[in-house]
Each structure stands twice: as C-alpha cells, then as structure tokens.
C-alpha cells in the first residue's frame, strides 16, 4: 500500500487556506472532484464538490470553500476563506469515479487554525474577502454520499498537532448550496 503522507498548514483565524491538488489530465479532467474532511474513526465527509462533469475554470462555492478545476493544468484548486479555529483537521481531495471507489489525490492536508492577529499593518486579503459581497445564485450540488471503506482504514492516528473538534463544531454551509463566483486572479 502507498504510504499516506500529510502536509501541515498552520494558519491564523481569518486567513485563507489555498492548496492545489494535482491529477492526471487524460484520466480525470472532467471527473467530479471533492474536498473532504477526515475525522478520527469516521468516514471521510464531503464538504464541497465540483459539478458533474466538472467544468473548466468554473468556481463553485460552498459556504467558505471555493473549488476551481483547471482542466488545462490538471489542478483542482481549493480555498477555505475566513478560517476559523473549528476548521482545524485533516483534509483530502478525491476524484469520484463511480462505480469504483473515489481516487484520493495526495497528499492530505493537516490544517491547524489558531486564534490571533493574522496580518501585519497594511496587509490585505481583499481578493478572498470580496467573496461575501457577490450576490449568490445557487443550485443543488450533487455530491455522491458514498465513501471508500478502504480510505477509512487508512486514516492516520490523530496528530498531536491536530486541534480536535466535535462534529457539531465545524459550521460549514449546507453542502447542497452551491454558489457561483468569479475567479479571483
């Protein structure tokens, strides 16, 4: 079995986690992709997913999570804006490929969000904060609910760096509410 590895990000409340998941262009360009959280002893939970088929460079927002799938680059970009302490946890990108199990994109992300002032005088993160000023148009997300049992057995033991959060504490918008937003370049 391939050894699972983690990449750790320690960020402050209010900051943005901005990561990219690399995938094989020929196989997965139009496949539906998802961002999941993995909690100890539980199945990975899908927080947001792209459309099916996944559209190129077409941002999808679910609460504070923004997904953009760049087919021409073979990259799924995931942003979690306005981070809260409760967002701390272990995350992963997966590709849905029914009827087969979801394909996990390496590496997993260990996010640790701490309280405290994130910026320096004059710092500016408007490019992501502007997200909240956009009038939303919503559609129903069709995120598959199945999760690979194999993925669960691979879930690593809880890291000492992990800030544990009860299930009810991660307050993300209902996954069925998808908001289209313009690209922030």
């Amino acid at each position: 079995a391939t050894k699972l590895t983690e990449e750790k990000y320690e960020l402050k409340e209010g900051q943005t986690l901005d990561v990219k998941c690399d995938y094989t262009l020929e196989k997965f360009a139009s496949s539906q992709k998802a961002w999941q959280i993995i909690r100890d002893g539980e199945m990975p939970k899908t927080l947001a997913c792209t459309e099916r088929p996944s559209k190129n460079s077409h941002p999808v927002q679910v609460g504070r999570i923004i997904l953009e799938d760049y087919h021409d680059h073979g990259l799924l970009r995931v942003r979690m804006v306005n981070l809260q302490v409760e967002d701390s946890g272990l995350y992963q990108c997966v590709i849905y490929q029914p009827p087969k199990e979801p394909h996990m994109l390496f590496d997993r992300i260990r996010l640790v969000v701490t309280k405290g002032f994130s910026g320096t005088p004059g710092s500016n993160e408007n490019s992501t904060q502007n997200v909240y000023k956009i009038p939303p148009t919503t559609t129903k997300a069709l995120c598959p609910l199945y999760t690979s049992p194999r993925t669960v057995t691979q879930a690593p033991p809880k890291s000492t760096a992990d800030v544990s959060t009860p299930d009810s504490e991660i307050n993300l918008t209902n996954v069925t509410d998808i908001i289209r937003v313009p690209v922030f370049n």
Partner: antibody, heavy 119, light 108 residues
Framework: EVQLLESGGGMVQPGGSLRLSCAVS????????MSWVRQAPGKGLEWVSE????????YYADSVKGRFTISRDNSKNTLYLQMNSLRVEDTAIYYC????????????WGQGTLVTVSS | EIVMTQSPATLSVSPGERATLSCRAS??????LAWYQQKPGQAPRLLIY???TRATGIPARFSGSGSGTEFTLTISSLQSEDFAVYYC??????????FGQGTKVEIK
C-alpha cells in the same frame, strides 16, 4: 532520506546546448511536481521551470521559454532540463527542487550544478 | 507577474538580538508565501511556508506573519548560524513563481 543530485553542468559557448539531470531518491518521485531554480553568481534566486507530477503540465519563465525544455523519467526517478540557444545571462548555478504536493513551494533542494556560458 | 520586494537589502544585527525582515508583494498572494535561508556555498533551505507555518526541523525562534501583500519574517534571538541571506517567494495562482531579491543578515 530525501536526496536530489544535479549533474550535467559545465562550460559552453553562447548558442550551445546542455542537458542537466537531477537524480532523486527518498520519496515517490512521480507524485510530486519538480522545479529548476537558478542563481547567477552573486545574485538572487530565479525560478526557471516546473513540471507537475500527476498531470505532467510544464511551465517556464519568460526568460527561457522556447529555449529550455523540462522533462522527467519517472521510471528512473530523474528530472531533466534541456537547455538550447544558451546565452551569457544563463550563467548560473542550477538547482532542482522538490515541491510540496499542495503548492509550488520548495521543501527539498539539490546542491546545484554550475552552468557557465562564455565565449 | 507578481513582483516581490524585500527590505532592507542588508540588516546588521548583534547575536542575541531580534531581526525583522519584510517582504511585499505587488498584488495579494493571500497566505501563499514562503521564506528560505541560504548560506554561502549552500542550497536554499525552506524555513516558513503558508506565511506562518514552520517547516520541519526549523527552530521556534523563526516565525512568519502577514497576509495579502505584507509579510514579515522574525528571528527572535539571532544565533551565529542564522547569519545568511533570506528570500521570500510567492506561490499564488500559477507560474511564474517569483522570489524577492533577498535580505542579507550580517553580524553587527
């Protein structure tokens, strides 16, 4: 232990060619993006080129576009940089660097190989 | 292309003192910023990424802060091995990835 070892540097005349290699060990090479970064004598760092792991997408700095080609052989755990039409300003130490899976930041570097372009 | 500007070019500090290095991006890069240390004759070494996360094995005296366009690397109490050149790098969006011109931290 992660290791990156560059080779192929040397002296070449303007207009000439060189092929740099970077042999890696200690991680699953095919999974990670790799970059070449150079440093002219006494100067700062300049990113040159990147090749993604899974997608195989390639990117180049404007200063080398059309002259340099990045490639990789996952079966040999080796990254390459083919440099053609070399110019005096390409003189530098060339480093290969492993990237994070999740972002283009460089967590492991080789010791570099010196390329000197001079007539 | 995102231009990264570091200041000062040279910082003269006594051992045991605090050093504060600045890096400014020409446009917002969110938290997509890394800091590297380079000593003469050596390859760069990753210190900080995501603006504030210490890389594996980096001592706690190194800390990063900032977001958007303004970033700071702080070395709380300079040790002899910390005298080196420090570079910031943005990894926002897509290539080209750009570095600052470097700040040399020298012994006062």
């Amino acid at each position: 232990e992660v290791q990156l070892l560059e080779s192929g540097g040397g002296m070449v005349q303007p207009g000439g060619s060189l092929r740099l290699s970077c042999a890696v060990s200690g991680f699953t090479f095919s999974r990670y993006a790799m970059s070449w970064v150079r440093q002219a004598p006494g100067k700062g760092l300049e990113w040159v080129s990147e090749m993604r792991g899974s997608s195989g997408s390639t990117y180049y700095a404007d200063s080398v576009k059309g002259r340099f080609t990045i490639s990789r052989d996952n079966s040999k755990n080796t990254l390459y940089l083919q440099m053609n039409s070399l110019r005096v300003e390409d003189t530098a130490i060339y480093y290969c660097a492993k990237e994070f899976s999740s972002n283009s930041l460089f967590d492991y570097w080789g010791q570099g190989t010196l390329v000197t372009v001079s007539s | 292309e995102i231009v990264m500007t570091q200041s000062p070019a040279t910082l003269s500090v006594s051992p045991g003192e605090r050093a504060t290095l600045s890096c400014r991006a020409s446009q917002s890069v969110n938290s997509n910023l890394a800091w590297y240390q380079q000593k003469p004759g050596q390859a760069p070494r990753l210190l900080i990424y995501g603006a504030s996360t210490r890389a594996t094995g980096i001592p706690a005296r190194f800390s990063g802060s900032g977001s958007g366009t303004e970033f700071t690397l702080t070395i709380s109490s300079l040790q002899s091995e910390d005298f080196a050149v420090y570079y910031c790098q943005q990894f926002y969006n897509f290539p080209p990835w750009t570095f600052g011109q470097g700040t040399k931290v020298e012994i006062k």
